[in-house]
Interface confidence: low
């Protein structure tokens, strides 16, 4: 068998096996050893008995999309039956005190691989065996305490394979440099030891995709918003826009990142290089907000000049840094392979990404404020408790809640809260009434809100003793 | 978006009882081992006890083994501590966290004074 | 029972610094440790899992290590921030065992 016939059925074309050249991956057109890696088909019984207590999940995830020329990472995770995992050495026990559906086992191991491995017969005196082999045949690679990874992880993609010893999770990257754009299938078969062979034990696929576009998101931040998320804000108060480029591999870090916005209401363009910016909407309505990043990454050269006269001397080939944009027609989609042979170049490409957004823009409540507070005269006999009233004005649209959270005095550790609706006229002044159980110093958190915002003032208050000798000490502010 | 939510703590005599509640949300409640975790005032962070996922499998701490139950209801992605027979260094913050203090809840202050 | 013993119990550092937390246990407990930052009236948040794993969104100047009985925490590059007491855990058995915990001023 050919690792084709074992890990998939996506045959690529013979251009994109050409093109999409991986480095340290192998060609699946290898032979596959089915005596130490049997093969078996979905739906074989064998599956049901590959694993004792149950079957092994693998997760596979990758940090795609990934920017054309970065490294794209895929992680594989296995996820083993109820109260088993793999301890230091390796092996695969039982959770101590954790008890399954078959009861707590006497036999803390699930796979005692240290045992077997230490028994290491067959070894030549490189202490290398005939089965401590990938399913190509190539010999594992011996690192400090390679005996205790026990998988083998079989990694398929674009006609290429990669083979890895690990433990219950491994890690993979790859350079996207020669990855035709779109998107892409990977394929991980994981094997476990078993005696001198191997047994198949999970099979997971996921898309990955590889992009000329700068994946862009951009988050949005008011204050008094009351919900950030539904892309509707308030007018008359800046709005901070936070560009996050995904880039998880940091193919750009070293690159000038330009950010051009178009806030849609006219204002003009807005050019910077700062990944956050504040604008402010002072009308109401709909608006298409847009963003175009542009970045010089790294990227594939353009075709040499063609090669001086052979009377002249051959110049040295200095490194040189040359830049061009990604949508120039010709080199960048050409012929990648050859473009970058040229020997010690260093180009680099403009990149784009693009972010629009239809945002929405209303009235809101820009501020409150609390103008005066007052200990509210109550009768005898004292009661522990004291009123105090809130006088409260506030701008912007007008409120139909209120909602008063007390806490200590570092306002960490709420007390209580009460909120409820209120009825205020066109010149937004209300008067809120509080109860303080006891006194001391108190954190008092007061919004106001509608529809769409939530406007906040704090305040620290100090409610004094009930002491019926002395009269009342009135609290303004 | 994880949350725990600890309801139920306050102030009692010794010997009196109280139940905690914890109310999860943001993941697969069934799914995780739950823990309580308390820490009584200006001290370090104590194990009180634990349960697996379907709630066959509880453990204690010695201090509290016969006087605390550990329970879970999956059904409505709730934790619970039963507490009978309260003692003064029962007295702390009491945090619902999951299995070993992944995602931890805002504590619930347990007070036990005569 | 798993003791875990935390060492400094205190310690005093300047921003920009780089300071180290111990946890030695009393028997191997196979990297089933957890680092914890806590501050005054907070919850304590998870900084590493499973010894060296670095949990999503916290600083990447914080870096576990070690193996069988000892483990240790790390902060490179001290910030204001930083100043917090610092707890391990091991899962590795019942009971769970917490350190002492480690109380960082910055000075």
């Known amino acids: 068998k050919r690792f084709h016939d074992v890990l998939g059925n996506e045959r690529p074309s013979a251009y994109m096996r050409e093109h999409n050249q991986l480095n340290g991956w192998s060609s699946d057109e290898n032979d596959w050893n089915e005596k130490l890696y049997p093969v078996w088909k979905r739906g074989d019984m064998r599956w049901k008995n590959s694993w004792k207590g149950g079957r092994v999940q693998a997760v596979l995830t990758s940090d795609s999309p990934a920017l054309v020329g970065s490294n794209i990472t895929f992680a594989v995770n296995l996820i083993f039956p109820r109260c088993q995992k793999e301890d230091a050495n390796g092996n695969i026990v039982y959770e101590k005190n954790c008890r399954n559906e078959a009861g707590l086992s006497a036999d803390p191991y699930v796979y005692n691989w240290t045992a077997w491995s230490e028994d290491s017969d067959g070894e030549n005196g490189t202490g290398q065996s005939h089965h401590n082999v990938f399913p190509d045949g190539k010999p594992f690679p011996h690192h400090p305490g390679w005996r205790r990874w026990n998988f083998i992880y079989v990694f398929h993609t674009l006609g290429q394979y990669f083979q890895k010893l690990g433990r219950c999770s491994v890690r993979v990257s790859v350079n996207t440099a020669n990855v035709t754009l779109g998107p892409q299938l990977m394929e991980v078969t994981v094997y476990r030891r078993h005696g001198r062979a191997y047994v198949p034990i999970a099979q997971v696929k996921d898309v990955y995709v590889v992009t000329d576009q700068i994946p862009v998101f951009v988050t949005m931040f008011q204050k008094n918003d009351r919900n950030s998320s539904d892309e509707t804000f308030l007018k008359d108060l800046p709005i901070m826009f936070d560009v996050l480029i995904h880039d998880p591999s940091h193919f750009l870090n070293y690159s000038t990142i330009n950010y051009k916005w178009s806030f849609g209401d006219n204002t003009g363009l807005f050019v910077s290089t700062n990944h956050t910016v504040n604008h402010t909407y002072v009308l109401n309505g709909t608006f298409s907000l847009n963003l175009t990043v542009k970045a010089a990454a790294p990227g594939p050269c353009p075709p040499p000049p063609p090669p001086p006269r052979p009377s002249k001397p051959t110049p040295s080939l200095a490194t040189t840094l040359k830049s061009y944009d990604s949508n120039t027609p010709g080199p960048a989609g050409d012929n990648p392979l050859e473009l970058s042979r040229i020997p010690d170049e260093n180009c680099q490409i403009n990149r784009y990404g693009h972010f629009q957004a239809t945002i929405t823009i209303v009235e809101g409540i820009l501020e409150v404020n609390i103008i005066q507070m007052t200990d509210v005269l109550m009768p005898v006999p004292w009661p522990e408790s004291s009123l105090i009233d809130f006088v409260v004005t506030c701008q912007g649209s007008i409120p139909t809640e209120v909602c008063t959270i007390i806490s200590d005095p570092t306002c960490e550790i709420t007390q209580n809260t009460v909120c409820s609706p209120v009825d205020v006229d066109e010149m937004c002044l209300l008067t809120v009434r509080r109860t303080f159980n006891g006194s001391g110093t108190y954190c008092v958190n007061l919004t106001l809100g509608d529809d769409t915002s939530l406007a906040l003032t704090s305040t620290l208050i100090s409610v004094p003793d009930r002491d019926p000798a002395s009269p009342l000490r009135m609290a303004n502010s | 978006e994880v949350q725990l939510v600890e309801s139920g703590g306050g102030s009692v005599r010794p010997g009196r009882s109280l139940k905690l509640s914890c109310a999860a949300a943001?993941?697969?409640?069934?799914?995780?081992?739950m823990t309580w975790v308390r820490q009584a005032p200006t001290k370090g962070l104590e194990w009180v006890a634990s349960?697996?996922?379907?709630?066959?499998?509880?453990y204690y701490r010695d201090s509290v083994k016969g006087r605390f139950t550990i329970s879970r209801d999956n059904a409505r992605s709730s934790l619970y501590l039963q507490m009978d027979s309260l003692r003064s260094e029962d007295t702390g913050t009491y945090y619902c966290?999951?299995?070993?203090?992944?995602?931890w809840g805002q504590g619930v202050m347990v007070t036990v004074s005569s | 029972d798993i003791q875990m013993t935390q060492s400094p119990a205190s310690l005093s550092a300047s921003l920009g610094e780089t300071v180290s937390i111990e946890c030695l246990a009393s028997?191997?407990?196979?990297?089933?440790l957890t680092w914890y930052q806590q501050k005054p009236g907070k919850s304590p948040q998870v900084l590493i899992y499973?010894?060296?794993g670095l949990q999503d969104g916290v600083p990447s100047r914080f870096s576990g290590s070690g193996s069988g009985r000892q483990y240790s925490l790390k902060i490179n590059g001290l910030e204001s921030e930083d100043a917090a007491t610092y707890f391990c855990?091991?899962?590795?058995?019942?009971?769970?065992?917490f350190g002492s915990g480690t109380k960082l001023e910055i000075k």
């Open positions: 855990l091991q899962d590795s058995e019942y009971p769970l065992t």
């Open positions: 943001g993941f697969t409640f069934s799914d995780y081992y």
């Open positions: 349960i697996n996922h379907d709630g066959g499998g509880t």
């Open positions: 499973s010894a060296s």
């Open positions: 028997e191997d407990i196979y990297n089933y």
């Open positions: 966290t999951t299995r070993a203090g992944w995602h």
